[in-house]
């Protein structure tokens, strides 16, 4: 091991304060006691250390805690968190939501870094499930967080946590993710009345099955076209023209503009043309009058 340079007389750091910004890297290494640094981590953030100086401070903590930092230190890492690697973070055991918030604050306004992703992963795994407070926090910092999770990971979200989800949090979710989230949302909002229920469930409807869409069509919900376009194609296809008209209400006129796009295009292909004509929108491509429609899926089920 390389022999360490001794701290010059009178230069030993007795507290973590602004005088340390004038210390050279070797002086920080020689004169700052790691235990002192650990107990006064909350002061580091207020001191304009250079990146090189922060490297030295990180090295001192790494030496003191080779198995991973304790939470008392992690909570006060501040900008030193940006120096941590995912490998460092995997050694941590973060259980406090306050610690998580403190570290997410450091990275605020930036894309989710590998460090942050690892931190969140460690935190959620430590908790065992994605509870409401955690979800609240994560989606506040990263609106797209929920949609970055796999369907398997989303399955650990308790229905109670769904209350924390805002519409924009689901913007980038794909149908597989909404398939997992929708039943949870349905459960979470089940005691709400019709119009309030629809407002809450609306952003999750990309995971709704046909029977739920049929039920909604009986409730005068006036679904907007943007929501309709995000519905599962397989859930929309069995809906009748009358059901779609009731589901969309005054927004039904918007179907014309979307007739070449899924799921509207595929739905039109499944409807009788004379049923489509009743809408008076000039929708074309339905099944001509007199044609017999065979539901092959039904036939397969019977055989």
């Amino acid at each position: 091991e390389v022999e360490k340079t001794a701290c010059p007389s009178g230069k030993k750091a007795r507290e973590i304060d602004e005088s340390l910004i004038f210390y050279k890297k070797w002086e920080l290494e020689a004169c700052v006691d790691a235990a002192l640094l650990a107990t006064q981590m909350d002061r580091v953030n207020a001191i304009p250390f250079t990146y090189e100086q922060l490297d030295v401070l990180k090295h001192k903590l790494d030496e003191l805690y080779p198995q991973g930092y304790p939470e008392s230190v992690i909570q006060h890492l501040g900008y030193l968190f940006l120096k941590m690697s995912p490998e460092d973070i995997r050694k941590w055991n973060v259980t406090s939501l306050e610690t998580l918030k403190a570290l997410l604050e450091v990275n605020k306004g930036h894309e989710m870094s590998p460090q942050v992703a690892t931190l969140i992963d460690r935190f959620v795994k430590g908790r065992g499930q994605l509870d409401k407070d955690t979800l609240d926090t994560l989606t506040a910092f990263y609106p797209g967080y929920l949609c970055s999770l796999s369907p398997e990971e989303l399955s650990s979200v308790p229905p109670s946590s769904i209350w924390a989800v805002r519409p924009q949090d689901l913007d980038t979710c794909d149908p597989r993710q909404l398939d997992v989230l929708y039943p949870k949302a349905r459960l979470a909002f089940q005691n709400m009345n019709g119009s309030e229920y629809f407002v809450k469930i609306q952003s999750f409807l990309g995971g709704a099955p046909t029977e739920d869409l049929k039920a909604l069509s009986q409730q005068n919900v006036s679904m907007d076209l943007a929501t309709f376009m995000k519905l599962r194609t397989d859930a929309v296809l069995p809906l009748t023209v009358a059901e779609v008209q009731k589901l969309l209400g005054p927004h039904v006129e918007g179907l014309k503009a979307e007739e070449r796009h899924r799921p509207v295009r595929d739905w039109i292909l499944r409807q009788r043309q004379d049923d489509l004509d009743t809408l008076g929108l000039g929708l074309q491509g339905g099944i001509p009058n007199g044609y017999l429609v065979l539901d092959l899926s039904m036939q397969e089920a019977l055989s």
Epitope: S9, G10, K11, R14, D33, L36
Partner: antibody
């Protein structure tokens, strides 16, 4: 509250070794950033810094007295001991122990007068 | 040897302002913070100013400290009879670890 108290012989003979004990309460010498020092003051004269022992057992001594001084601590007993060899009448002084927290001597003992005389 | 130089004595009438100077070098005051201690007759010293100009709780704001280059000074405004005491400046030192000034006796006339 934080308190420090010096104890030791009031009279020592020239060439003898002085042993002083500082017993403290209200803080721990294993807490980061904390240390205990010895400072002396000859009658009617200025304060003179002697030695310091820190939370991490780091020891510092006055350059001019380095060869004669030894400082040690017993954290479990909350005590710091200073020994000073080869005492001389010019070492007659009130000896204070003081806690240093951060950069400052924030609490002092009442002092103990040591007279060196044959 | 006294490393920090202070005037042996200063005096002032009640209500007046007095200053006590403390001169050092780049190895102490020039590169480190200055503290001031007050020693009332027959008692142990008491921390009066730390970090050049900060007051511990309980110290009246009549006491203030400043530092410039390798010198420091203590100012006392609205002088009171109970301020009569010895005042010591001190600093960490790159050569001597920690040093005190020779002390200044303040007399309130």
């Amino acid at each position: 509250q934080v308190q420090l108290k010096e104890s030791g012989p009031a009279l020592v003979k020239p060439t003898q070794t002085l042993t002083l004990t500082c017993t403290f309460s209200g803080f721990s010498l294993s807490s980061s950033g904390v240390g205990v020092s010895w400072i002396r003051q000859p009658p009617g004269k200025a304060l003179e810094w002697l030695a310091l022992i820190d939370w991490d057992d780091d020891k510092s001594y006055s350059t001019s007295l380095k060869t004669r001084l030894t400082i040690s601590k017993d954290t479990s007993k909350n005590q710091v001991v200073l020994t000073m060899t080869n005492m001389d009448p010019v070492d007659t002084a009130t000896y204070y122990c003081a806690r240093i927290q951060g950069w400052n001597y924030d609490v002092w003992g009442q002092g103990t007068l040591v007279t060196v005389s044959s | 040897d006294i490393v920090l130089t202070q005037p042996p004595s200063v005096s002032g009438a009640p209500g007046q302002r007095v200053t006590i100077s403390c001169s050092g070098s780049s190895s102490n005051i020039g590169n480190n913070r200055v503290s001031w201690y007050q020693q009332l007759p027959g008692t142990a010293p008491k921390l009066l100013i730390y970090g050049n100009n900060k007051r511990p709780s309980g110290v009246p704001d009549r006491f203030s400290g400043s530092k410039s280059g390798t010198s420091a000074s203590l100012a006392i405004t609205g002088l009171q009879s109970e301020d009569e005491a010895d005042y010591y400046c001190s600093a960490w030192d790159l050569l001597e670890v920690y040093v005190f000034g020779g002390g200044t006796k303040l007399t309130v006339l």
